[in-house]
Interface confidence: medium
């Protein structure tokens, strides 16, 4: 069966949008008006993994690009990166674990926990124009809560 996907944008709980920063990095900043067109549109795929009522495994690709968010160890630290893949083979139902995030719903907000590195989350900084990263703390200075906006295909 083909993997199911939908297009969406994400904003952090401070309403910062995610945009490309160079070829392999995302950053978070406040956008208004026409600048909103800069925000990244994700193709969120619903993949195989541990699932519960509030937790759904997903992969986050960039729409119409062969790039996926993935979690790898760099210098012994879990790190978020944009990884290039062969578009003939992706997305797929059984994504490699580094591409899988547990989309967790809490009080109408979403967290994206790395399946590869439990308790590490897609995060943004309080500061403007900083990279999106994988953070190992929740409820601290860094932001781990997001909202999702559906985008028509």
């Amino acid at each position: 069966a083909p993997v199911r996907s939908l297009n969406c944008t994400l904003r952090d709980s401070q309403q910062k949008s995610l945009v490309m920063s160079g070829p392999y990095e995302l950053k978070a900043l406040h956008l208004q008006g026409q600048d909103m067109e800069q925000q990244v549109v994700f193709s969120m795929s619903f993949v195989q993994g541990e699932e519960s009522n509030d937790k759904i495994p997903v992969a986050l690709g960039l729409k119409e690009k062969n790039l996926y968010l993935s979690c790898v160890l760099k210098d012994d630290k879990p790190t978020l990166q944009l990884e290039s893949v062969d578009p003939k083979n992706y997305p797929k139902k059984k994504m490699e674990k580094r591409f899988v995030f547990n989309k967790i719903e809490i009080n109408n907000k979403l967290e994206f926990e790395s399946a590869q590195f439990p308790n590490w989350y897609i995060s943004t900084s309080q500061a403007e124009n900083m990279p999106v990263f994988l953070g190992g703390t929740k409820g601290g200075q860094d932001i781990t809560d997001f909202t999702m906006q559906f985008v028509s295909s």
């Epitope: 069966a1 939908l6 619903f46 699932e51 009522n53 989309k103």
Partner: nanobody
């Protein structure tokens, strides 16, 4: 052409049991996650349960957990829902859904659904 034909509904007393069946055709049944959704009178669609392709993972709405059991027989291209300890609030039309995928706590996607079978729980 995809076809999903539900059966097994009926009138049952509170605390009773029913077993719903869904006969599938027109697609490679074993390849697809399947599930059940329901629509109570005057209400919207509500997800009830789903089962992964191969049947090794099952998922249930909190409202039916511990009372309902979903299963599948790929050799017969049939999906089942065993419903025990039925309550008045389980009264609904039950639909079988093909390629049912959960996208959030309250949102699901599916490709096809059947005509439905009515379950009425009343004394």
């Amino acid at each position: 052409e995809v076809q999903l034909l539900e059966s097994g509904g009926g009138l049952v007393q509170p605390g009773g049991s029913l077993r719903l069946s869904c006969a599938a055709s027109g697609f490679t049944f074993e390849d697809y996650q399947m599930g059940w959704v329901r629509q109570a009178p005057g209400k919207g669609l509500e997800w009830v349960s789903s089962i992964s392709a191969m049947g090794n993972r099952t998922y249930y709405a909190d409202s039916v957990k511990g009372r309902f059991t979903i299963s599948r027989d790929d050799s017969k291209n049939t999906l089942y829902l065993q419903m025990n300890s039925l309550r008045a609030e389980d009264t609904a039309v039950y639909y079988c859904a093909e390629n049912l995928v959960k996208i959030s706590r309250r949102h699901w996607m599916f490709d096809y659904w059947g005509q439905g079978t009515l379950v009425t729980v009343s004394s």
